[in-house]
């Protein structure tokens, strides 16, 4: 017996061939011997089966001895053994119709679980293998679960249902609602304007929700809310903003925040959360601000950084065009009685400069001794 796999909603063609390439009598019946369709004279006739309005045949191929049955808009209940009777012989075709759907909305927050459910007829023994856009492979029986979705799981999932060495492929589009980056760090010199950007990793027709940026300054004992905002159809409106610092927020996506001045007291890390309408849970992005200051006071040249820096970062003071350098894996370096010239303060990671600040040291003339 031939086995044919079909997809719910699709069209399937069950083939039946006569040995002689000519138009002849044929009938298609289901397992209960109820006639579905057949030929009477030169005309296609239909029986009292449930399939009558969805079953058809390719009349153009009859004279070639091909008496296929086409079933449109397949339903799981169409799964059955179909019998083609032609030239005093019977050909049996077992049709198994499957459907694969996501249990919940296909727009899921990062970290949420995805469950794919296979709709299958009684008597089937399917297995399912799914491949994520990022190349992750999962397999199961009638249910497949991905416990924690990641950004890279966004896109088209390809799932193959196998039964009796036959396969049928399903494509399911999954959108993981997340920010493009989990974390980002902005490096600024003291006094510079700071731009924070929070681009989303997805696009939606209508995007509505509310968000907040909480900030933990390095120098502060507790965190505080810097800004709260609403999002309505991709339009951003500020609800409440702290007085210090006076943040500004862009009115369009991507979410964009401007801090007028980078100051040591603002250095630290923040967490932007975004709650989307009709979604449980929140999107998160961490943002860090590192501020650098270079100062000369009397005979001491100092370079300092504030904010979250990793221990492997190097802070250096270097005299331009000269070999003189002071380096430390620390948050402050200094030079006593620095030579005159342009000094560079550099914050670097394995040789890559993340932040630099220049400071000019002017020569100090010895104070004339009073006679």
């Amino acid at each position: 017996k031939k086995v044919v796999l079909g997809k719910k909603g699709d069209t399937v063609e069950l083939t039946c061939n006569a040995s002689q390439k000519k138009n002849t009598q044929f009938h298609w019946k289901n397992s209960n011997q109820i006639k579905i369709l057949g030929i009477q004279g030169l005309f296609l006739t239909k029986g009292p089966s449930k399939l009558s309005d969805r079953a058809d045949s390719r009349k153009s191929l009859w004279d070639q001895g091909c008496f296929s049955m086409i079933i449109k808009n397949l339903k799981i209940e169409d799964s059955d053994t179909y019998i083609c009777e032609v030239e005093n012989k019977k050909e049996e075709v077992e049709l198994l119709v499957f459907g694969l759907t996501a249990n919940s909305d296909t727009h899921l927050l990062e970290g949420q679980s995805l469950t794919l459910t296979l709709e299958s007829p009684p008597g089937s023994s399917p297995s399912v293998k799914c491949r994520s856009p990022g190349g992750k492979n999962i397999q199961g029986g009638r249910t497949i679960s991905v416990p924690q979705l990641e950004r890279q799981d966004s896109g088209t999932w390809t799932c193959t249902v196998s039964q009796d060495q036959k396969t049928v492929e399903f494509k399911i589009d999954i959108v993981v609602l997340a920010f493009q980056k989990a974390s980002s760090t902005v490096y600024k010199k003291e006094g510079e304007q700071v731009e924070f950007s929070f681009p989303l990793a997805f696009t939606l027709e209508k995007l509505t929700g509310s968000g907040e940026l909480w900030w933990q300054a390095e120098r502060a004992s507790s965190s505080k809310s810097w800004i709260t905002f609403d999002l309505k159809n991709k339009e951003v409106s500020v609800k409440r903003v702290t007085q210090d610092p006076k943040l500004q927020m862009g009115k369009k996506l991507p979410l964009h925040l401007t801090l007028p001045q980078a100051l040591p007291q603002y250095a630290g890390s923040g967490n932007l959360t975004l709650a989307l309408e009709a979604k449980t849970g929140k999107l998160h992005q961490e943002v860090n601000l590192v501020v650098m200051r270079a100062t000369q006071f009397q005979e001491n040249l100092t370079c300092e950084v504030w904010g979250p820096t990793s221990p492997k970062l190097t802070l250096s003071l270097k005299l331009e065009n000269k070999g003189a350098t002071v380096s430390k894996q620390a948050k402050a370096v200094w030079v006593l009685n620095p030579e005159a010239g342009m000094w560079q303060c550099l914050l670097s990671d394995s040789g890559q400069v993340l932040l630099e600040s220049n400071i000019k040291v002017v020569p100090t003339w010895p104070t004339p001794v009073q006679p």
Epitope: T117, S120, P121, S125, K129, G141
Partner: antibody, heavy 125, light 107 residues
Amino acid sequence: QVQLVESGGGLVKPGGSLRLSCAASGFTFSDYYMNWIRQAPGKGLEWVSYISSSGKTIFYTDSVKGRFTISRDNAKNSLFLQMNSLRAEDTAVYYCAREDYSNYEDYYYYYTGVWGKGTTVTVSS
Amino acid sequence: EIVMTQSPAALSVSPGERATLSCRASQSVSSKFAWYQQKPGQAPRLLIYNASTRATGIPARFSGSGSGTEFTLTISSLQSEDFAVYYCHQYKNWPYTFGQGTKLEIK
């Protein structure tokens, strides 16, 4: 542990209705296909209905089509059988049962392994 | 629908002896076949699925064989708790069907 407990059975007159419930516990109910099977007094077993994990795919045996409705509430871990236009021949113990599977390499074997203790339905005037 | 025919309808065997129960399907059910045991006032208990795979917790004295249309359940050495009604079951085609049962009695 895995448990299925049926309830809602009782005595009903021909033409009457009953709603059977099956409370599931000890497993993730929403992952499993479920079934109702019945056994007339002193008789053999008859498969009544089959429902997919999502509730979208449903099959009935011919003798109950149009009269019985199987449904499920995954949030409440419950399976139901609404029985209308009851007849004397519907008198039976009704069992709810879970479809299980095991796999060997890529091949999956399905079977009905977990049954409840049953609830008795008597249709009599 | 597929008709399942069990033989014999009743079987009397002494404890410790071997019992062989048969089941025939009216058409091929491949290996989508199971055996159940039922004791009075209890729900059926799955013994064998996939024609020959023992269900979890089923003693090794129970074994199933066959495929297509002919199936056999063998109990190698009968224990007192094995006396019950045994049903065969096909789950290849809807509606799923059972045999009429074989009553295994103590001789």
